[in-house]
């Protein structure tokens, strides 16, 4: 029986050109994490394997950095990075847990003229 839960960084709205960290955390289970995959839509961005370490997909190598921890850092954001990202935890003996994070990357013109958050 799968008892674990995935906690994520939560959805993120960022400006073009910036960088963000995507993170997930698996809790409430004693299952062993064997591998974590990071995907966007149907594209594999990166893999962190418990034995083999990190592998970043060649097409993302220049803009994606491993970590912190099992997370992923996305740099030099473009509006095309807008989309849903999945952290897929492969565990034994539980099986697979998936977390979802939506990243919205805004053109600076949209960020300036749209609904703005007041800075405390």
């Amino acid at each position: 029986m799968m008892t674990g839960t995935i906690e994520t960084t939560g959805n993120i709205s960022a400006e073009k050109g910036g960088s963000i960290i995507l993170q997930c955390h698996l809790s409430s289970t004693t299952a062993q994490v064997t591998q974590v995959n990071w995907e966007q839509q149907d594209q594999l961005l990166a893999i962190c394997n418990a034995d083999l370490g990190w592998h970043i997909s060649p097409s993302f190598k220049d803009r994606v950095a491993p970590g912190p921890g099992l997370g992923l850092t996305l740099q030099s954001l473009t509006v095309n990075d807008t989309g849903e990202y999945f952290c897929i935890y492969h565990t034994y003996p539980d099986g697979t847990y998936t977390g979802r994070i939506f990243l919205e990357v805004l053109e600076s013109s949209v960020a300036e003229h749209g609904a703005r958050f007041q800075i405390p």
Partner: antibody
């Protein structure tokens, strides 16, 4: 002025499929995410999913996966939602809504769908 | 999914009253950068829902200053300082921090 103009009311038979359109005007269509929301029984609001007009990416509420398919036509600034294998449970008002920073700032006028034999 | 609970379900008022609507979530709505995507909407009969407040406390353009939002973490409040006839309708909160976004069940603001 931002406007989202939806297609008109529909009466369809169970088992059929139908497509609702949402034509955007007054802003840069590719600069904002488009969401779809279901309102049942004149009360409950449920998020169906979203589409990113710029790259065609989608995100769905698991509850509506296989029920709704979201697409866009950038040339006409129009978003579409196709609803499949309709049943009486799908009878509702459906809204398209633009979002920015995960709040829905502009909404279409709603499309009433009635599924009945 | 994050469960969003709104209270009360119904709120009978007299014009000129000050009222509060509560919205509670099953987990914190602050993301890892400390931003909270919690918004409030008014849905009047025969109209589309309209955005009132975004990011907990920011009034959307054209929204009167009698509307205010507050809260943090899992507990949020919408206040109307002086209820006017045009404020009657269904109020909804929406959390956009976690996938999928989820709405509260709604609060009906109606005349006593």
């Amino acid at each position: 002025e931002v406007q989202l103009q939806q297609s008109g009311p529909e009466l369809v038979k169970p088992g059929a499929s139908m497509k609702i359109s949402c034509k955007a005007s007054g802003y840069s269509f590719t600069g904002y995410i488009m969401n779809w929301v279901k309102q049942s029984h004149g009360k409950n609001l449920e998020w169906i999913g979203l589409i990113v007009p710029n790259n065609g990416g989608t995100s769905y509420n698991q509850k509506f996966k296989g029920k709704a398919t979201l697409t866009v036509d950038k040339s006409s600034n129009t978003a579409y939602m196709e609803l499949l294998s309709l049943t009486s449970e799908d009878s509702a008002v459906y809204y398209c809504a633009r979002s920015l920073r995960f709040s829905f700032d502009y909404w279409g006028q709603g499309t009433t769908l009635t599924v009945s034999s | 999914d994050v469960v969003v609970t709104q209270t009360p379900l119904s709120l009978p008022v007299s014009f000129g009253d000050q009222v509060s609507i509560s919205c509670r979530s099953s987990q914190s709505l602050a993301n890892s950068y400390g931003t909270t995507y919690l918004s409030w909407y008014l849905h009047k009969p025969g109209q589309s829902p309209q955005l009132l407040i975004y990011g907990i406390s920011n009034r959307f353009s054209g929204v009167p200053d009698r509307f205010s939002g507050s809260g943090s973490g899992t507990d949020f409040t919408l206040k109307i300082s002086t209820v006017k006839p045009e404020d009657l309708g269904m109020y909804y909160c929406l959390q956009g921090t976690h996938q999928p976004p989820t709405f509260g069940g709604g609060t009906k603001l109606e005349i006593k």
